[in-house]
């Protein structure tokens, strides 16, 4: 602890100029004071001034008022500093002396004589308020005040609490009257060394080194560090934890950059046609009658459906068509005949049958002929009977289908499975495609038949097809192909347009 006992001498009265021994001072009592402060004693005794002592220069002769003086000789109030915890009790002895000698240092002069002394014993709390008192004896009167205050940086009831304001990285505070710390704005903690971060700054994901700051930990962003950072390159995805890439609806792939809902996002099909998604960035437009083209953007000729019957010729008009009928026929589609069986309308040996009481007829055609008048030779390939790209060939009264590799049957409708002979090595999965089998290889193998064991960089062998980008390190001992527009599959080997149920995600 550390503090100061302060004594303010105010007035001393010795009207007769007498000493304590009854003698008078000549020419007057040149008065100085000795003060002794010590621990509380019920009976004041001689001995060391345990709390301190001080002497004044000559302050006046006989009776005088003592002026406040803050420096130099004759300082008033008198200061008695102490370096211990103030006990709250004390004993004080104030002696008035006459000196015949030096005004400034009377203590050292010989022949000093006691004028009077007073003793005060009691309790005194630390505080700024002066306690005023007056002591009389038969010859003299002394008026004085005293108090105990703490030294700079000491606080509390006994001046025992040290506190120094500071504003550095070991504390940002001022001191309260009781010596406790009062944190400067923006700081908290026992020693006011913890900054108060920006209001709302996430407790786990953000921190600060000075007030009103919010520094994000790795993987987090935003003013309050409450937004995760998705995987680098994540296009149409979000995260709930850092480095995630959870795809938005309609998007797929490692970076959510493959459009699974091209129809909704881009509306590519025109003229009221129906759009069907078929894998990333793939779609099919089903046109309404009268339209064609990849996006149904092309209007068909109104005559394309061959609406004119009985050999009538069709002419396109702005929003319609017109049938030019051959002789003997009439109607919008040349569907009505003016001929009867008497006109021998049936060609190629067709036999005529009258209808509607002889007002019209119908031809029954011999084999290999057709048409309302048996005028057309039958082309058995017209109906495209051959499936899976088979070629149709007319062979006299019949026709045959010449099938493409991998297909068989009368109409090439039967698929010959290339996978039946298990061409994929090392547990690869086989897929039958038009151009033959394709193998999807397990981790650690590559090649068209999974015959190549990967012993180093999985991407070194160029496993990704169709210009896809290969990534390694994203899954153990493996690679990931990021497919270009229009291709899917673990190696991007499948063009868009495969059945939707076909597996394409790596």
């Amino acid at each position: 602890g550390s503090g100061i006992f302060q004594l303010r001498l105010q007035e001393f009265v010795n009207q007769r100029g007498m000493l304590a021994n009854g003698q008078s001072c000549e020419p007057g009592c040149r008065t100085f004071f000795r003060i002794c402060l010590k621990h509380f004693q019920a009976t004041f005794s001689e001995g060391p001034c345990t709390f301190g002592n001080v002497s004044t220069p000559v302050l006046g002769t006989n009776s005088f008022v003592v002026r406040d003086k803050n420096s130099g000789s004759g300082r008033n109030p008198l200061q008695l500093p102490f370096n211990f915890t103030w006990p709250g009790t004390f004993s004080l002895n104030i002696q008035a002396w006459h000196t015949p000698g030096d005004d400034l240092r009377p203590e050292t002069s010989p022949g000093n004589s006691l004028i009077s002394q007073i003793i005060i014993q009691g309790s005194l709390a630390v505080g700024k308020i002066w306690r005023t008192d007056e002591q009389n004896d038969t010859l003299t009167r002394l008026s004085y005040s005293y108090r105990v205050i703490c030294s700079d940086n000491y606080y509390g009831e006994s001046c025992s609490r040290l506190c120094k304001k500071r504003d550095d990285h070991f504390g940002h505070y001022e001191c309260q009257p009781d010596g406790s710390l009062s944190c400067l704005p923006g700081w908290t903690g026992k020693y006011c060394d913890q900054p108060i971060c920006l209001s709302g700054c996430h407790e786990q994901n953000g921190y600060c080194s000075k007030p009103d700051e919010c520094i994000c930990r790795p993987g987090w962003q935003g003013r309050l560090c409450n937004e995760c950072i998705p995987h680098n390159g994540c296009r149409h995805g979000t995260c709930s934890i850092p480095w995630q890439c959870a795809c938005d609806e309609g998007w797929g792939g490692l970076f959510c950059d493959q459009d699974l809902n091209y129809c909704t996002h881009h509306s590519p099909c025109k003229n009221g046609s129906t759009c069907s998604n078929s894998g990333p960035k793939g779609y099919t437009c089903t046109c309404l009658p009268g339209y064609t083209g990849e996006h149904c953007e092309l209007g068909l000729s109104k005559c394309a459906s061959n609406p004119c019957r009985n050999g009538g010729s069709c002419k396109d008009q702005e929003n319609s068509y017109h049938c030019l009928c051959p002789p003997g026929y009439y109607g919008q589609h040349c569907e009505h005949s003016t001929l009867t069986c008497a006109d021998s309308p049936c060609f190629n040996g067709g036999s005529c049958r009258e209808r509607n009481q002889g007002s019209s007829y119908a031809c029954e055609c011999p084999p290999n002929f057709t048409g309302s008048n048996c005028e057309k030779k039958v082309d058995r390939c017209t109906s495209n009977p051959c499936a899976n790209g088979g070629q149709c060939q007319n062979r006299g009264p019949s026709r045959t289908c010449r099938c493409r590799p991998g297909f068989t049957g009368t109409h090439c409708e039967l698929h010959i499975s290339d996978c039946a002979r298990s061409p994929c090595a090392h547990g690869g999965t086989c897929h039958d495609l038009e151009n033959g089998p394709v193998c999807t290889c397990p981790a650690g193998f590559s090649g068209r038949r999974c015959e190549v064991r990967i012993t180093h960089d999985a991407c070194a062998s160029g496993p990704c097809f169709n210009g896809a980008t290969c990534y390694t390190g994203l899954s153990p001992n493996n690679f990931v192909c990021n497919c270009p527009y229009g291709f899917v599959g673990s190696r991007c080997e499948f063009p868009v347009g495969l059945p939707p149920s076909f597996p394409w995600v790596a």
Partner: antibody
């Protein structure tokens, strides 16, 4: 009881960068109650404070060395490091790492044993 | 830059009191720490915040600080107290050490 151990090359060539690491054991470097400092002492001379850092990476440097000093912390390894660039013979000293306690008003209550770094070609 | 000044040396007889001063501008407004360093050893904190002793430091070590001067007092000095003593304070955000005082026990 916390212990600090300095490590790094004992000889550095002039104009190069001095690099030292202090490994903390027996306590976590991630405590908010401490700063982790570097102090040096040239042979036969007094102590010179270089700088310090806390667990979140807030650094404070001696103004006379600031342009050449970098202090960093690696909480996962319980280590902090000193880099002093463009060294000269005047940087030859015993380099100490120390723990400065907030509760001690910044007093360094734990020290490493020190490592002598000589700058010479 | 802030400077702390110490006397280069102080001599004391065994059992007597040694006082080491450390002076700096308005030093009494700052907290002062004192370190003891014996030859070939790392410094040891003996006083922090002007007058506080860490656990394990003998009671004969005491400190005070007011005005422009801080003082480390070793009462009843022993031969084992012979060492270099450094004062340290914080100026703004930087640590500052005194020049050091060699205490010799006669």
């Amino acid at each position: 009881e916390v212990q600090l151990q300095e490590s790094g090359p004992g000889l550095v060539k002039p104009s190069e960068t001095l690099s030292l690491t202090c490994t903390v054991s027996g306590g976590s470097i991630s405590s908010g109650s401490y700063y982790w400092g570097w102090i040096r002492q040239p042979p036969g001379k007094g102590l010179e404070w270089i700088g310090d850092i806390n667990y979140i990476g807030s650094t404070y440097y001696n103004p006379s060395l600031k342009s050449r000093v970098t202090i960093s912390v690696d909480t996962s390894k319980n280590q902090f490091s000193l880099k002093l660039s463009s060294v000269t013979a005047a940087d030859t000293a015993v380099y100490y790492c120390a723990r400065e306690a907030v509760s001690f008003g910044g007093g360094a209550d734990s020290w490493g044993q020190g490592t002598l770094v000589t700058v010479s070609s | 830059s802030y400077e702390l000044t110490q006397p280069p040396s102080v001599s004391v007889s065994p059992g007597q009191t040694a006082s080491i001063t450390c002076s700096g501008d308005r030093l009494g407004d700052k907290y002062v720490s004192w370190y003891q360093q014996k030859p070939g050893q790392s410094p040891v904190l003996v006083i922090y915040e002007d007058s506080q002793r860490p656990s394990g430091i003998p009671e004969r070590f005491s400190g005070s600080n007011s005005g422009d001067t801080a003082t480390l007092t070793i009462s009843g000095t022993q031969a084992m107290d012979e060492a270099d003593y450094y004062c340290q304070a914080w100026d703004m955000e930087a640590g500052v050490f005194g020049s050091g005082t060699k205490v010799t026990v006669l």
